[in-house]
Amino acid sequence: EPHSLRYNLTVLSWDGSVQSGFLTEVHLDGQPFLRCDRQKCRAKPQGQWAEDVLGNKTWDRETRDLTGNGKDLRMTLAHIKDQKEGLHSLQEIRVCEIHEDNSTRSSQHFYYDGELFLSQNLETKEWTMPQSSRAQTLAMNVRNFLKEDAMKTKTHYHAMHADCLQELRRYLKSGVVLRRTVPPMVNVTRSEASEGNITVTCRASGFYPWNITLSWRQDGVSLSHDTQQWGDVLPDGNGTYQTWVATRICQGEEQRFTCYMEHSGNHSTHPVPSGKVLVLQSHWQ
């Protein structure tokens, strides 16, 4: 998995008038890292992990960059011609990556009312847009504004390709991101489903990195994919992830089923609790 830094900026307009506030979220290696969600931006680390990465310093630099980018995006939204009455949003997502072989990738994507209409490869400076006429109109609108206003909106390009990578390298230097392996806590619960059946759910939480194998086995053999329901692997707000897998089994056969978990080279199996009690499995030994 490459290391990545992802900026997600959102600005809003109401009845054609651009609102003063904006929302900025920054993800480091897919984890919520920084956030600005007030009228007046103040970069806030998302959890202890983010604070550890940033170290003992103020986040003035991050605040300055995010505020500047928010202002630029508001100016861009103001130049979108076809704004109808009501609420509209313009979103810019910028991503840079450093791969294992040290190669880099950077891209920028614009969304209007949640719909992608313009993308740019920040290395090749190549623009792409969806085929729909609405997207093409919006794309031309925004591209023209960015070209015309390139001098005025220097800050718009400030945290792009080079600076995004510079920031990412700076964060990685802390070592916190590179070193981190946090094993999951796994717990198995049961609930009545229908007559003679129970649903067993296996939850893994608090793990990092996000790659995990979680599956149900009967007598040691994996159940087929279509007999299991998987939850997405989602950030849990603490710089770690959570997920779950569930399946339906016959009541009385609980002892035959185990939840198998594999993460960062470690593995464990977790039985179904015999009663309706929640059984907590600790970290692996």
């Epitope: 009967q218 007598d219 040691g220 053999v221 994996s222 159940l223 087929s224 279509d226 007999t227 016959c250 056969e253 002892q255 035959r256 198998y260 594999e262 080279g265 593995h267 039985p271």
Partner: antibody
């Protein structure tokens, strides 16, 4: 006594079909996952198919996928293997085998039948 | 698919010898590994499950070890009835057997 007895083997032309049966006794078949395993003359064991107790998980070895179908009828205490488009290389002794239900099991086969011989000739 | 490689494919030993058979998986299979014994004209018999657990009724001279990709079946003191072919089998990803190890009299 816990026992598995296979039947249905015999001589069949290449491209032909055959249905093997395996009857269980001494235990409740419906509670167990079952398998078919074969052994070509002078060769090693080859797992070919698995079906779990609820028949909602079925696996096949690549060598038989699309040609063989595993099924079970718990009321008749029987496991089946429908073999179509038979080839010379399907010639083997076919065993049915039960997956152990012991706690901590890892898909081990604790009860085996005596085997039934299938010969495919071209 | 996971490949299971047994070595040696055959070995000659005497009664009382300590015999070791190895099984290597093409990728990590945790402890999802079982061992069987088969005598000519007979069905296989389960010896060890979960890499190291002895199946009920199997003599304690048989033992298994290993985890991940490398596994070992050991017969501490070979008895006359132990001359047979031994197979490993994995259930980590569907199911596959190793090629077998034939143990015959030296």
């Amino acid at each position: 006594e816990v026992q598995l007895v296979e039947s249905g083997g015999g001589l069949v032309q290449s491209g032909g079909s055959l249905r093997l049966s395996c009857v269980a006794s001494g235990f409740t078949l419906s509670s167990y996952s079952m398998n078919w395993v074969r052994q070509a003359p002078g060769k090693g064991l080859e797992w070919i198919s698995y079906i779990n107790s609820r028949s909602n998980t079925i696996y096949y070895a690549d060598s038989v996928k699309g040609r063989f179908t595993i099924s079970r009828d718990n009321a008749k205490k029987s496991l089946y293997l429908q073999m179509n488009s038979l080839r010379d290389e399907d010639t083997a002794v076919y065993y049915c085998a039960r997956v152990s239900s012991i706690t901590g099991n890892t898909g081990a086969f604790d009860v085996w039948g005596q085997g039934t011989t299938v010969t495919v000739s071209s | 698919d996971i490949q299971m490689t047994q070595s040696p494919s055959s070995l000659s030993a005497s009664v009382g010898d300590r015999v070791t058979i190895t099984c290597r998986a093409s990728q990590s299979i945790s402890s999802y590994l079982n061992w069987y014994q088969q005598k000519p004209g007979k069905a296989p018999k389960l010896l060890i499950y979960a890499a190291s657990s002895l199946q009920s009724g199997v003599p304690s001279r048989f033992s298994g070890s290993g985890s991940g990709t490398d596994f070992t079946l050991t017969i501490s003191s070979l008895q006359p009835e132990d001359f047979a072919t031994y197979y490993c089998q994995q259930s980590y990803s569907t199911l596959t057997f190793g090629g077998g190890t034939k143990v015959d009299i030296k």
